[in-house]
């Protein structure tokens, strides 16, 4: 099946201090390689989460990514702050014969708006 990375929401709004879910699904796990979430694009993009076993404070996977046929790579960001605002991209990589892996497809991006916490 042809690989497609889908981020269904173009944007989400979340109150500061709350949690938000950023959805991402794949149509294929091939070619093998990691899935990572970034905020922003280009050289200055920031790694938010990687499905390769490392620990990321405040960010967790939504579904059980250890399922061998898992296609859901959605993440939950907890205790959102204004600094978390920006556009988040779910990115599929193909493993490389040497570092780094090759980016092969990105979702369309989900913009996160952080609303002031109601007083």
């Amino acid at each position: 099946k042809e690989l497609k990375v889908t981020q269904p929401e173009k944007s989400v709004s979340v109150a500061a201090g709350d949690s938000t879910v950023l959805n991402c699904t794949l149509t294929s796990l091939l070619p093998v390689g990691p899935i990572k979430w970034y905020r922003g694009v280009g050289q200055s993009r920031l790694l938010i989460y990687s499905f390769t076993g490392e620990h990321f404070p405040r960010v967790t996977n939504v579904s059980d990514a250890t399922k061998r046929n898992n296609m859901d790579f959605s993440i939950r960001i907890s205790n959102v702050t204004p600094e978390d605002a920006g556009t988040y991209y779910c990115v599929k990589f193909q493993k490389g014969p040497s570092e780094p892996d090759t980016e092969i497809q990105s979702g369309g991006g989900t913009e996160v708006y952080v609303l002031a916490k109601p007083s």
Epitope: V32, P34, R68, N69
Partner: antibody
């Protein structure tokens, strides 16, 4: 310190059943997929079965499908292998192993010996 | 099936390469497992083609390309004498497989 300790091995007769256990410590067991791998005397390693972190998804090599069942109890940090209708060909050391994110193995238990003999 | 040589030998300080072939690069990740005696617990020396666990010496390295993976031991030591199994996970079939093992003798 990360530890995987298998138990439940022993001598059984052909056709009998055995349940192996693997006690995990030193890591967040509920976050990792796990597998069982065996090694027959004088032979190489053979992967048998794997289970997702939550326990809902299981995977088997064809030769043990329907006879062996992998399961886990995350509240007890334990992995299990139920083995039915055992034959002499199942004689081996059985290892539990922790899976990496891409379903290879990073840590192994010391193994438990299963001998099937009449 | 994964294919690897039955045995290799080297003098201390030499570089050893063990090649494991038979996987499909598009769908396969490789690992390497060291077993010092039959029935003893395997030790992972490489996973994810080229990732070395933190407690494994830097003389062990791995690579993969095409349909093969390579374990390289640079400056082999007597204590590296063991059987080395290559292993693979196939993302197409969801199955793990192992090679038959390579016995490394350090002369």
């Amino acid at each position: 310190d990360l530890q995987l300790v298998e138990s439940g091995g022993g001598v059984v007769r052909p056709g009998e059943s055995l349940r192996l256990s693997c006690a995990a410590s030193g890591f967040t067991f509920s976050s990792y997929a796990m597998s069982w791998v065996r090694q027959a005397p004088g032979k190489g390693l053979e992967w048998l079965a794997g289970i997702s972190a939550g326990g809902s998804d299981t995977y088997y090599i064809d030769s043990v499908k329907g006879r062996f069942t992998i399961s886990r109890d995350n509240s007890k940090n334990s992995l299990y292998l139920q083995m039915n209708s055992l034959t002499a060909e199942d004689t081996a050391v059985y290892y539990c192993a922790r899976e990496t994110w891409n379903h290879l193995f990073d840590y192994w238990g010391l193994g438990t010996l299963v001998t099937v003999s009449s | 099936a994964l294919t690897q040589p039955a045995s290799v030998s080297a003098n201390p300080g030499e570089t050893v390469k063990i090649i494991c072939s038979g996987g499909d690069y598009y769908s396969t990740y490789y690992g390497w497992y060291q077993q010092k005696s039959p029935g003893s617990a395997p030790v992972t020396v490489i996973h994810s083609d080229d990732k070395r666990p933190s407690d494994i010496p830097s003389r062990f390295s791995g690579s993969a390309s095409g349909s093969a993976a390579t374990l390289t031991i640079t400056g082999v030591r007597v204590e590296d004498e063991a059987v080395y199994f290559c292993g693979a996970y196939d993302g197409r079939t969801y199955i793990n497989t192992f090679g038959a093992g390579t016995t490394l003798t350090v002369l």
